[in-house]
């Protein structure tokens, strides 16, 4: 199809080489009440849908994305040629940064209902650059945490080194929906709830004497509880002796509860004490059996394929540890009588 009639938007993605970050393009089909591009059911201002950036199509998931090769070749269907780019409804997600993402991206409705609709398309010229500005060492991360129940803020990474006074007007989106009230480089959240979690996009306009373009950054926000102040506790085994039958297989389970930690490095292991010798048990590995916002329960078994007389003289020790400290529980095997 002829893309000369598409409305054009220029975007800049400046990515940090230090961190993993994502990027999104919205299918900003022109709004029907403002534009002659899309001739379809007119919406009165009261009927404006919640997700403003892509209002051109009635079924917003029904859009097609293409990339325009720089050598003038025909348009390429994004889904077929670019595995690191994912289409989710009318949003294009770039999973990995890199200058190779630079180029022209075109979106249009899949269903062309009238001859006028041929021109109902948007061409987005995306320029991708690595961040070179070393003067701003502490720019906001593309992954930000908000502590549940407290006051927090979400900063626009591309503007976080500017004061609020210097900052240009910012347009914020959360999960693809316009946050019309927010216009500064920081969203302040008075009290954090779990619904504040999501993908936030901040846009601002930059211009020179020739043209203007949108600078965009994507922030993944997660809501978390505060780091635990407690060492893990062992839920099982509770008893320090266990009655067993000689010659039979035995599995002893160690279950421990670990409180939430942002940097989570849980240890749960078994080791065996036999007089002055001690050794670890490397298999099987640990597995998480229950995970909530506040804590995680992890289990690790020790498997004795056949209980021997020697095992009755040994101590089987479950050891659990987090950044606060460690806890142990030892089990002595006792032969079942009768």
């Amino acid at each position: 199809f002829n893309i000369s009639g598409c409305s054009t938007k220029k975007l800049l993605w400046t990515y940090s080489t230090r961190s993993e970050e994502e990027f999104v393009l919205f299918c900003d089909l022109p709004e029907p009440q403002k534009s002659h591009f899309c001739h379809r059911n007119r919406l009165s201002p009261k009927q404006v849908p919640e997700h403003l950036p892509f209002m051109g199509s009635n079924d917003l998931s029904d859009v097609q994305w293409y990339q325009q090769p720089s050598n003038g070749d025909p348009l390429e269907d994004i889904r077929k040629s670019y595995p690191h780019i994912i289409q989710d409804k009318c949003t294009l997600h770039f999973l990995t940064p890199g200058v190779n993402n630079s180029g022209s991206y075109i979106c249009r409705p899949k269903m062309i209902k009238s001859p006028y609709d041929v021109a109902c398309c948007v061409k987005m010229i995306l320029e991708v650059k690595p961040q070179t500005n070393a003067s701003c060492e502490y720019s906001a991360s593309h992954k930000q945490d908000l502590l549940l129940g407290s006051t927090g803020s979400i900063s626009c990474p591309s503007l976080s080194c500017q004061s609020d006074a210097q900052s240009p007007a910012v347009t914020w989106y959360k999960n693809g929906k316009l946050l019309s009230v927010e216009r500064s480089n920081r969203i302040v959240v008075d009290e954090v709830y779990d619904y504040h979690q999501g993908t936030y996009v901040c846009d601002y306009t930059q211009s020179d004497t020739v043209s203007s373009w949108t600078v965009r950054a994507v922030v993944q926000v997660r809501t978390i509880v505060g780091d635990t102040k407690l060492k893990p506790d062992i839920l099982d085994p509770v008893e320090d002796t266990l009655e067993v039958e000689l010659g039979k297989p035995l599995t002893i389970s160690c279950k421990a509860r670990f409180g939430f930690e942002r940097v989570f490095n849980p240890v749960i292991k078994w080791y065996i004490k036999d007089s002055d010798l001690e050794w670890e048990v490397s298999v099987p590995e640990a597995k998480s059996i229950k995970s909530t916002l506040k804590d995680e329960i992890i289990e690790r078994n020790i498997i004795l394929e056949k209980v021997t007389q020697r095992d009755l003289r040994r101590k089987f020790v479950c050891f659990v540890q987090n950044s606060i400290g460690n806890t142990t529980q030892s089990v002595q095997l006792k032969e079942k009588r009768g």
Partner: antibody, heavy 115, light 110 residues
Framework: SLEESGGRLVTPGTPLTLTCTVS????????MGWVRQAPGKGLQYIGI?????STYYASWAKGRFTISKTSTTVNLKMTSLTTEDTATYFC?????????????WGPGTLVTVSL | AYDMTQTPASVEVAVGGTVTIKCQAS??????LAWYQQKSGQPPKLLIY???TLASGVPSRFKGSGSGTEFTLTISDLECADAATYYC????????????FGGGTEVVLK
């Protein structure tokens, strides 16, 4: 003591089984494992068979490598071999029944995979 | 999971000197770490297990320390016989790991 055998020159895709012959070690009390080392490179863990016969593998070895044992031997069966599998293969004894701390090692057997 | 990073890759030390080799785990492994010595054309030899316990017959010049994610092997009063490649190995998990060994450190004596 431990001694590996069965290493030889094979073409890609050929299956191969290595044997570790054990003397003076009770395989019903100790874990046994296989570790390999490509020429001029570091050690790479393959997997373990526990004293009771349960097997566990490195993630890259799952499905292509199989460890089994008899009362005096520990075997490593390898399938779909590629040139990347060219290495000296060692068998080793674990400190305990399910331990991957290797306290006794065999001298190794060389497997060369070449076209 | 449990990737092991060993530094330096190579080190040159004088006879009688001391060398320190570091090993870092990508996740906490408590004290589940072993150190091995390997000489050219020979299988590895266990030096230290559970981070600091000397294996049978290993001289006390070899000292292991650390816990969690940071570990160190220190060899003091270096002898010619200590010229070898040293490997750390996590012994916390023997399944679903890419490789339990570090990349190795070559100790060259001058």
């Amino acid at each position: 003591s431990l001694e590996e055998s069965g290493g030889r020159l094979v073409t890609p895709g050929t299956p191969l089984t290595l044997t570790c012959t054990v003397s003076g070690i009770d395989l019903s009390s100790y874990a046994m494992g296989w570790v390999r080392q490509a020429p001029g490179k570091g050690l790479q863990y393959i997997g373990i068979i526990t004293y009771g016969g349960s097997t566990y593998y490195a993630s890259w070895a799952k499905g292509r490598f199989t460890i089994s044992k008899t009362s005096t031997t520990v075997n490593l069966k390898m399938t779909s071999l590629t040139t990347e599998d060219t290495a000296t293969y060692f068998c080793a004894r674990g400190l305990g029944g399910a331990s991957t701390t290797w306290d006794i090692w065999g001298p190794g057997t060389l497997v060369t995979v070449s076209l | 999971a449990y990737d092991m990073t060993q530094t330096p890759a190579s080190v040159e030390v004088a006879v009688g000197g001391t060398v320190t080799i570091k090993c870092q785990a990508s996740e906490s492994i408590s004290v589940n770490l072993a150190w091995y010595q390997q000489k050219s054309g020979q299988p590895p030899k266990l030096l230290i297990y559970l981070a600091s316990t000397l294996a049978s017959g290993v001289p006390s010049r070899f000292k292991g320390s650390g816990s969690g994610t940071e570990f160190t092997l220190t060899i003091s009063d270096l002898e010619c016989a200590d010229a070898a490649t040293y490997y750390c190995q996590q012994t916390y998990s023997g399944s679903n790991v890419e490789n339990s060994f570090g990349g190795g450190t070559e100790v060259v004596l001058k």
